[in-house]
C-alpha cells in the first residue's frame, strides 16, 4: 500500500537550508537530505517533511541520501554519507520504487 501521509501531531525539527524561515520548522516528520550536484561538494539540508514519506525509504546513492525521523529535533545532530562512486553499469537509480 502507498504510504498515507498524515497531518496528525506535528513535530518540531531543526531547519538548516537556504529556504528556512527560522532555525526550526514544524511538520509531520523531520528530514535530513544530503545532495551532491555535478561538480559541487555535497550539501546537507535539514527540515520538515509533510508529503511523500516514500522518499525516506529510498536507498542512498552517490548523489543523494534522505533520512527521516519522528521525534522532537531528532534531525539536529544527524550526519549522512553518500554511497561510494560505482562504475556506470552498476550505478543505482534514484527511483525508490
Amino acid at each position: 500500500d502507498p504510504v498515507k501521509p498524515s497531518r496528525g501531531p506535528l513535530v518540531t525539527c531543526t531547519c538548516e537550508s537556504p529556504h528556512c524561515k527560522g532555525p526550526t520548522c514544524r511538520g509531520a516528520w523531520c528530514t535530513v537530505v544530503l545532495v551532491r550536484e555535478e561538480g559541487r561538494h555535497p550539501q546537507e539540508h535539514r527540515g520538515c517533511g509533510n508529503l511523500h514519506r516514500e522518499l525516506c525509504r529510498g536507498r542512498p546513492t552517490e548523489f543523494v541520501n534522505h533520512y527521516c525521523c519522528d521525534s522532537h529535533l531528532c534531525n539536529h545532530n544527524v550526519s549522512l554519507v553518500l554511497e561510494a562512486t560505482q562504475p556506470p553499469s552498476e550505478q543505482p537509480g534514484t527511483d525508490g520504487q
Partner: antibody, heavy 118, light 108 residues
Framework: QVQLQESGPGLVKPSQTLSLTCTVS??????????WNWIRQHPGKGLEWIGY???????YYNPSLKSRVTISVDTSKNQFSLKLSSVTAADTAVYYC??????????WGQGTLVTVSS | EIVLTQSPGTLSLSPGERATLSCRAS???????LAWYQQKPGQAPRLLIY???SRATGIPDRFSGSGSGTDFTLTISRLEPEDFAVYYC?????????FGQGTRLEIK
Amino acid sequence: QVQLQESGPGLVKPSQTLSLTCTVSGGSISSGEYYWNWIRQHPGKGLEWIGYIYYSGSTYYNPSLKSRVTISVDTSKNQFSLKLSSVTAADTAVYYCARESVAGFDYWGQGTLVTVSS
Amino acid sequence: EIVLTQSPGTLSLSPGERATLSCRASQSVSSSYLAWYQQKPGQAPRLLIYGTSSRATGIPDRFSGSGSGTDFTLTISRLEPEDFAVYYCQVYGSIPITFGQGTRLEIK
C-alpha cells in the same frame, strides 16, 4: 507569482523519445516544500500522473510508465524535464507540469500537445 | 493502488442550482491529501479544494468540500455560468498519485 512553462517538440516520431522541459519562474525549484510533477491527458480523456521529482533528484514514477520514463532536474536553471522513450500513437496527449505542495497541485503549466506520428 | 471513482459521470443542472459531486476511494485515504480540480476546454486544471475542505486561493465560497475515509464530496452551492466544466478529485502526497475519471457538469 509562480509560473510553470512547458517546452519541447510538438511532433515526435514513433519509437523515438519524447523530451519536454518545464521552466519554473517566480519561485525556487530547490525549496524542500515542493515536488515537481508531470501529468498527461489523452485527447478527450482524464488526467494521468506520470511521475515527480524532488529537488534532490529523487524520482517516483507511475508504475504503468516506469520502464519508459525519466524525470530529471536542473536546479541551476530552475527547470525539470521529462523523457518518455519508445513512444507510440498512444502517447499522443497534452503534457502538463505542476508543482505539488501540502495544498495540492497548486500551480500548473498551460500544457503542451505532443503528437506521435510518422 | 488507490482507485478514485467519481459519480455521476455527467451532471446536468441549471445556473442557480446546487451541484453535488461524489468521489469514492477504493481504500481509506488521508483527508489531508484529497483535492478537487476544475478544468475547462483548452485549459490546464485549476486547484479548487485541498485537504478535503480547504479552498485554494481565489476560489469563491460557493465551492466547498467534505468527507473522510473513502467518501468525499464537492458541493457548488449555487451554480454560476462559469462553473460548467469537468471536475476531478485527486489523492496526492504519496505514491502513486491518482485522479478520478472526472465528472462533467453541463448546462441543462
